[in-house]
């Protein structure tokens, strides 16, 4: 399992992970106490046949070629959580591990 | 966590799971002894904003709107394995659980 890493200067057209810092303050999400911002990353790029395919299933669907099936798309294939401190809407403040907040790897599925 | 289920008669345009039987014999994959065919399913349809989003991350990237980020796409969000009996290319026959062969749920990520 591997994936490409790119930055804003990359000329890579294929499916790649790009850096992105999410700033909760800029969104006006004041119920989030911490972190104020975090490195979320995102996936972008083309999925040519077989390149970075995560599942054998993707290959099989391509072979079977059913009506309406799009080609694979560049999407997170590995994600990780972050710890957040936030108001839960019931006048309580909660510290919790929020899953799937950071993209660690991108692939075609 | 839920996803839509459709069939070939559905008029649903949104991200949906469709039935698909993969026929190894039709592919000419004669190294697979069993099963000869299985219900793989596939994902197809549109991902309007927020509909069936698997990850909070998807929403955050949409908010941050970085250069080159495509909208979310309809992709498997839950998959399951099947047991297969196959030649492994070293004159051995293997019985094994092959992961991510069946789409159980589709979503936007």
């Amino acid at each position: 399992d591997f994936g490409l890493d790119c930055d804003e200067h990359s000329t890579e057209s294929r499916c790649c992970r790009y850096p992105l810092t999410v700033d909760f303050e800029a969104f006006g999400w004041d119920w989030i106490i911490a972190p104020k911002r975090y490195k979320a990353n995102y996936c972008s790029g083309e999925c040519e046949f077989v390149f970075l395919q995560k599942y054998p299933h993707t290959h099989l669907v391509h072979q079977a070629n059913p009506r309406g099936s799009a080609g694979p798309c560049c999407t997170p294939t590995k994600m990780s959580p972050i710890n957040m401190l936030y108001f839960n809407g019931k006048e309580q403040i909660i510290y919790g591990k929020i899953p799937a907040m950071v993209v660690d790897r991108c692939g075609c599925s | 966590d839920f996803g839509l289920d459709c069939d070939e008669h559905s008029t649903e345009s949104r991200c949906c799971r469709y039935p698909l039987t993969v026929d190894f014999e039709a592919f000419g994959w004669d190294w697979i002894i069993a099963p000869k065919r299985y219900k793989a399913n596939y994902c197809s349809g549109e991902c309007e904003f927020v509909f069936l989003q698997k990850y909070p991350h998807t929403h955050l990237v949409h908010q941050a709107n970085p250069r080159g980020s495509a909208g979310p796409c309809c992709t498997p969000t839950k998959m399951s394995p099947i047991n297969m009996l196959y030649f492994n290319g070293k004159e051995q026959i293997i019985y094994g659980k092959i992961p991510a062969m069946v789409v159980d749920r589709c979503g936007c990520s």
């Epitope: 119920w31 106490i33 911490a34 972190p35 104020k36 309580q92 403040i93 909660i94 510290y95 919790g96 | -």
Partner: antibody, heavy 116, light 107 residues
Framework: EVQLLESGGGLVQPGGSLRLSCAAS????????MSWVRQAPGKGLEWVST????????SYPDSVKGRFTISRDNSKNTLYLQMNSLRAEDTAVYYC?????????WGQGTLVTVSS | DIQMTQSPSSLSASVGDRVTITCKAS??????VAWYQQKPGKAPKLLIY???SLQSGVPSRFSGSGSGTDFTLTISSLQPEDFATYYC?????????FGGGTKVEIK
């Protein structure tokens, strides 16, 4: 340099009211949640209240809920604690604190004495 | 409410000693524990948050560890300025609660 300066403490009779202020400088006040914590003489620390950066969300322990109100004026870089129906057990030094995962900067405190 | 039980309540130590203070939560608080230092007549100062993250500007002789219900603050080599009272706090869910404090005195 982060600075927090509490004021408004003093002697008040049981059942009375008091409003504490906390003037903040050295950081972008409107970006951070803020908290109040108190310490009775010779005792440990007790959390009193927290308010979100924009002022939309607040939280209190049962011991002060309904009697104390936390608020903020981001245009004045000031945090407030309105204390009503004061009791002898509210006697303490009251600290304001800048809130992150934990309270990462504290003021020097203001003493509130509730006594007849 | 989550109770935080700190031990010992006081200890005597010498400059250069390794000092360990423990804090036990009444229920699982993940890694949501902070440690503060307070000197007489002064405001508390944050040392550690999220169980093991060192607050900016705090000397590296301070370290925190633990998860779940058992947490430790360690001072690897006690300095003269470290004689103070130390408090743990859970920031897992409100009402946030503090331990009773540990007074570190000169032997």
């Amino acid at each position: 340099e982060v600075q927090l300066l509490e004021s408004g403490g003093g002697l008040v009779q049981p059942g009375g009211s008091l409003r504490l202020s906390c003037a903040a400088s050295g950081f972008t006040f409107s970006s951070y949640a803020m908290s109040w914590v108190r310490q009775a003489p010779g005792k440990g620390l007790e959390w009193v209240s927290t308010i979100s950066s924009g002022g939309s969300y607040t939280s209190y322990p049962d011991s002060v809920k309904g009697r104390f109100t936390i608020s903020r004026d981001n245009s004045k870089n000031t945090l407030y604690l309105q204390m009503n129906s004061l009791r002898a057990e509210d006697t303490a030094v009251y600290y304001c604190a800048k809130q992150d995962y934990a309270m990462n900067y504290w003021g020097q405190g203001t003493l509130v004495t509730v006594s007849s | 409410d989550i109770q935080m039980t700190q031990s010992p309540s006081s200890l005597s130590a010498s400059v250069g000693d390794r000092v360990t203070i423990t804090c036990k939560a009444s229920q699982d608080v993940s890694t949501a524990v902070a440690w503060y230092q307070q000197k007489p007549g002064k405001a508390p100062k944050l040392l550690i948050y999220a169980a093991s993250s060192l607050q900016s500007g705090v000397p590296s002789r301070f370290s925190g560890s633990g998860s779940g219900t058992d947490f430790t603050l360690t001072i690897s080599s006690l300095q003269p300025e470290d004689f103070a009272t130390y408090y743990c706090q859970q920031h897992y869910s409100t009402p946030w609660t503090f331990g009773g404090g540990t007074k570190v005195e000169i032997k």
